[in-house]
């Protein structure tokens, strides 16, 4: 089948990184600068992505693959494809529509991205607060006085951070 196809369509012989040039009797011409073809048999090359502004180039465009971008310092990727860069905030802040805002009392954010999350409620587990929470750190829960005995662990780890799934809209 492949042989038949290539006899019928000379373009199928053109490899990735080239295009089938109708203006030159369907010969395989290299992709021009700033363009690529990732598969064989293409009649045009695609324009390379430009990583500009909040983006920087993670992988240069080649004749066979598109450029890949990530975010410049002060920004972080959103989504698996890093199609958006969101502004970093300081620890103890979250990004709102009006910019970075400090976490409200009783909440914290220990990262430069994501949302402020409530402090752990130690009393729900029958524990007491060993170390008070701040805007940047969760509280540290310790055992209730009745639990204190030799060899007992005095600190429980803070609640795990969750991915906020935030977007810049």
């Amino acid at each position: 089948f492949e042989r038949t196809r290539s006899l019928q369509d000379p373009c199928s012989n053109c490899p990735a990184g080239t295009f089938c040039d109708n203006n030159r009797n369907q010969i395989c011409s290299p992709c021009p600068p700033n363009s690529f073809s990732s598969a064989g048999g293409q009649r045009t090359c695609d324009i390379c992505r430009q990583c500009k502004g909040v983006f920087r180039t993670r992988k240069e465009c080649s004749s066979t693959s598109n450029a890949e971008c990530d975010c410049t310092p002060g920004f972080h990727c959103l989504g698996a494809g890093c199609s958006m860069c969101e502004q970093d905030c300081k620890q103890g802040q979250e990004l709102t529509k009006k910019g970075c805002k400090d976490c409200c009392f009783g909440t914290f954010n220990d990262q430069k991205r994501g949302i402020c999350r409530p402090w752990t409620n130690c009393s729900l587990d029958g524990k007491s607060v060993l170390v008070n929470g701040t805007k940047e750190r969760d509280v540290v829960c310790g055992p209730s006085p009745a639990d204190l005995s030799p060899g007992a662990s005095s600190v429980t780890p803070p609640a795990p951070a969750r991915e906020p799934g935030h977007s810049p809209q």
Epitope: Q50, G53, V54, L78, A80, G81, S83, M84
Partner: antibody, heavy 117, light 106 residues
């Protein structure tokens, strides 16, 4: 807060040109692409092209090359789209939309263009 | 250019019903965006990079897929979800949109 405000509705004659504006506020205008999208009455969305205001670099949908010209003025944080040799086929709502690699969720309210004699 | 075909073109659902619509690409793309548009309004970003919910979008919306086949699901239809939904690819220039799925309330 990010805002994109487009110029008002236009009624123009066939064969003439029109320049639509999109004023951006609430973000660093030079760091983000500005895209333009066409929507004919009762129809879907068509990407016209994009401009990077930082250096004026443009990408066009081949279908709109020669029809649309995109420019941007950094000093006023305004993007422009000029449409030339207008026909009834150009009657549509035109949206500006901020872009990163894709369009990132901030759109203008749309400008209605009517081409009629 | 990459052609995105949405199906069905028109559909209706009762409140509380699960809704799924699809977007098929003429060649493989890495990621898809989904928009919701109501008459007289600008499109609203719902999903970016195939499965990430945009800010303020209800969790009843979800996206999935890969390669040439993508879908948008509403777990429980609400009256306010009646709108036209568009998929869009940013993988390859020119950016392209699907023809849209109009979702009506029964």
């Amino acid at each position: 807060e990010v805002k994109l405000v487009e110029s008002g509705a236009e009624l123009v004659r066939p064969g003439s040109s029109v320049k639509i504006s999109c004023k951006a506020s609430g973000y660093a205008f030079s760091l983000y692409w500005m895209n333009w999208v066409k929507q004919r009455p009762g129809q879907g969305l068509e990407w016209i092209g994009q401009i990077y205001p930082g250096d004026g670099y443009t990408n066009y949908n081949g279908k709109f090359k020669g029809k649309a010209t995109l420019t941007a003025d950094k000093s006023s944080s305004t993007a422009y789209m000029q449409l030339s040799s207008l026909t009834s086929e150009d009657s549509a709502v035109y949206f500006c939309a901020r872009g990163q690699l894709g369009l990132d969720g901030y759109w203008g309210q749309g400008t209605t263009l009517t081409v009629s004699s | 250019q990459i052609v995105l075909t949405q199906s069905p073109a028109i559909m209706s659902a009762s409140p509380g019903e699960k809704v799924t619509m699809t977007c098929s690409a003429s060649s493989s793309v890495s990621y898809i965006y989904w928009y919701q548009q109501k008459p007289g309004s600008s499109p609203r970003l719902l999903i970016y990079d195939t499965s990430n919910l945009a800010s303020g979008v209800p969790v009843r919306f979800s996206g999935s897929g890969s390669g040439t086949s993508y879908s948008l699901t509403i777990s429980r239809m609400e009256a306010e979800d009646a709108a036209t939904y568009y998929c869009q690819q940013w993988n390859i220039y020119p950016y392209t949109f699907g023809g849209g799925t109009k979702l009506e309330i029964k």
